[in-house]
Interface confidence: low
């Protein structure tokens, strides 16, 4: 609805009346509206609401609202809708971050690595190798390295020491034996809470060049692995957006374990223990999977001398 005068407006703008050539000082229109009729010697300016699909952020003296930016390109989602007062703002959805004008899935820290810094909509996850006394037994983009189980506090002993990838295995020792391996029938207590029930391996896909049985599961989200490792990395002179083929060249012992999460199918790149033979540590060459999705439009910045 057009309105004649909004209260508490302090801003004014200068307008040249084309009929008389006179320079007039008119009151600005409030944010969310535009000047549908400029003031004259005898009348106030008239403001009208921005039509659907347009906006003005500030009080203004402009004759047409700004067009909202295009709908968010996949896989982006709307952070702010297109409304009379706001332009559409796009952001990356949960589990992804903005990278090179599109959204990329957060890095999945592999087994033996934990999350050093959580990912956000603008920043990738940072991974770090599990320090002494901690481990990570599942690939995850959210889990930190966990401390080993304290066997002693449970009146148990360490049957098998933990590694970067496995927890301590606790057990009881028969009093008559000084052996460090459990005798048959001895209870061993792994920590069940470390098994993430939402990521149960169901099938394995081994890259080209390795013998495997192809999984016939349906399509899957393709996370990246180790794209932003901080500790223990080697200098990264590799491409930051390698395709599938380069992943296999860089890490020849890579396996993709197809974890089924309810209706979801997720490929998780998992480093194989055989890599430790090269020097005790896992390869930490940063890897990026191909970026999917669509570049964000250049959200046009509007500036008008009669706005603000």
């Amino acid at each position: 609805q057009p309105e004649q005068k909004a209260s508490n407006l302090i801003g004014t703008y200068r307008h040249v009346d084309r009929a008389t050539g006179q320079v007039l000082t008119c009151d600005k229109c409030p944010a969310g509206t535009y000047v549908s009729e400029h003031c004259t010697n005898t009348s106030l300016r008239v403001c009208s609401s921005c039509p659907v699909g347009t906006f003005t952020r500030h009080e203004n003296g402009i004759e047409k609202c700004h067009d909202c930016s295009q709908p968010c390109p996949w896989p982006m989602i709307e952070k702010l809708p297109c409304a009379a007062l706001t332009d559409r703002e796009c952001t990356c959805p949960p589990g992804m971050f903005q990278s090179n004008a599109t959204c990329a899935p957060h890095t999945v820290c592999p087994v033996g690595w934990g999350v050093r810094k959580k990912g956000t909509e603008t920043e990738d996850v940072r991974c770090k190798q599990c320090a002494r006394g901690t481990f990570s037994d599942v690939p995850s983009s959210v889990m930190k390295c966990k401390a080993y189980t304290d066997c002693l506090s449970q009146n148990l002993v360490v049957i098998k020491p933990g590694t970067k990838e496995t927890d301590n295995v606790c057990g009881t020792l028969p009093s008559f034996s000084s052996s460090t391996s459990p005798s048959p029938g001895t209870a061993i207590f792994p920590r069940p809470e470390h098994m993430e029930t939402h990521e149960v391996p169901s099938s394995t896909y081994v890259p080209k060049g390795m013998n495997s049985t192809e999984s016939n599961s349906s399509a899957s989200v393709r996370p990246k692995v180790l794209s932003s490792i901080q500790e223990g990395t080697v200098p990264d002179n590799t491409s930051s957006a390698r395709g599938k083929e380069d992943v296999n060249k860089t890490l020849p012992n890579l396996q993709v374990v197809n974890h089924q999460q309810g209706p979801h199918h997720r490929h998780i790149l998992k480093l194989l223990p055989s890599m430790e033979a090269t020097g005790g540590e896992k390869s930490s060459t940063p890897i990026k999977g191909p970026k999917r999705g669509h570049p964000r439009q250049n959200l046009h910045k509007h500036f008008d001398i009669n706005e603000h």
Partner: antibody
Framework: EVQLLESGGGLVQPGGSLRLSCAAS????????MQWVRQAPGKGLEWVSV????????MYADSVKGRFTISRDNSKNTLYLQMNSLRAEDTAVYYC?????????????????????WGQGTTVTVSS | DIQMTQSPASLSASVGDRVTITCRAS??????LNWYQQTPGKAPNLLIY???RLQSGVPSRFSGSGSGTDFTLSISGLQPEDFGTYYC?????????FGGGTKVEIK
């Protein structure tokens, strides 16, 4: 049995409109994104449009943008393609197809995969 | 848009032959390529997705390979029901685009 059945094709004059329907059965329709693909007589396949499982996101080929509208009614397990301002070059068999799996929409993002279920097609002829 | 170019446009083969069809993308599409078979008067049928993964229910004589821009579909021992037209399709980005097709005919 998983099935898609298109209907609504026919002969229409240039500038006219048609609405195609695609009835889905045998699967949870609301979990899948759906596509329209067309094939002109004696020609190859051309992708037309995609719609997300909820219907909240759509995308179109440049050749139909602004003229065609994809929509869906999950309560009726039906996909639609509203075709306006039809041209002779829109003459084709129109197929609806199911994206092979799209639950990742529920995480807020989407990846494109193969179309694993197709309808038998419905013929649209635009001619004066 | 990403252009997909298939070759050959057509080929003649006999039952039992090994057939290879190639598909080239105008820009890298990593491994995001699907293959379909279409027989006359019927809808296409998904054979391979993600360049090399066999769709459920598709015979193992079909195989796919390649990444980046160059891809191959192989049929190792052509069967009578394999005659028809084969299409590649990139699933890297919208708009989804198909190759022009390769018609496999009986020699």
């Amino acid at each position: 049995e998983v099935q898609l059945l298109e209907s609504g094709g026919g002969l229409v004059q240039p500038g006219g409109s048609l609405r195609l329907s695609c009835a889905a059965s045998g699967f949870t329709f609301s979990r899948y994104s759906m596509q329209w693909v067309r094939q002109a007589p004696g020609k190859g396949l051309e992708w037309v449009s995609v719609i997300s499982p909820s219907g909240g996101s759509t995308m179109y080929a440049d050749s139909v943008k602004g003229r065609f509208t994809i929509s869906r009614d999950n309560s009726k397990n039906t996909l639609y393609l509203q075709m306006n301002s039809l041209r002779a070059e829109d003459t084709a068999v129109y197929y609806c197809a199911r994206e092979s799996y799209s639950s990742s929409w529920y995480s807020g993002y989407y990846y494109y995969y193969g179309m694993d279920v197709w309808g038998q097609g419905t013929t649209v002829t635009v001619s004066s | 848009d990403i252009q997909m170019t298939q070759s050959p446009a057509s080929l003649s083969a006999s039952v039992g032959d090994r057939v290879t069809i190639t598909c080239r993308a105008s820009q890298t599409i990593a491994g995001y390529l699907n293959w379909y078979q279409q027989t006359p008067g019927k809808a296409p049928n998904l054979l391979i997705y993600d360049a090399s993964r066999l769709q459920s229910g598709v015979p193992s004589r079909f195989s796919g390979s390649g990444s980046g821009t160059d891809f191959t579909l192989s049929i190792s021992g052509l069967q009578p029901e394999d005659f028809g037209t084969y299409y590649c399709q990139q699933s890297y980005t919208i708009p989804l685009t198909f190759g022009g097709g390769t018609k496999v005919e009986i020699k």
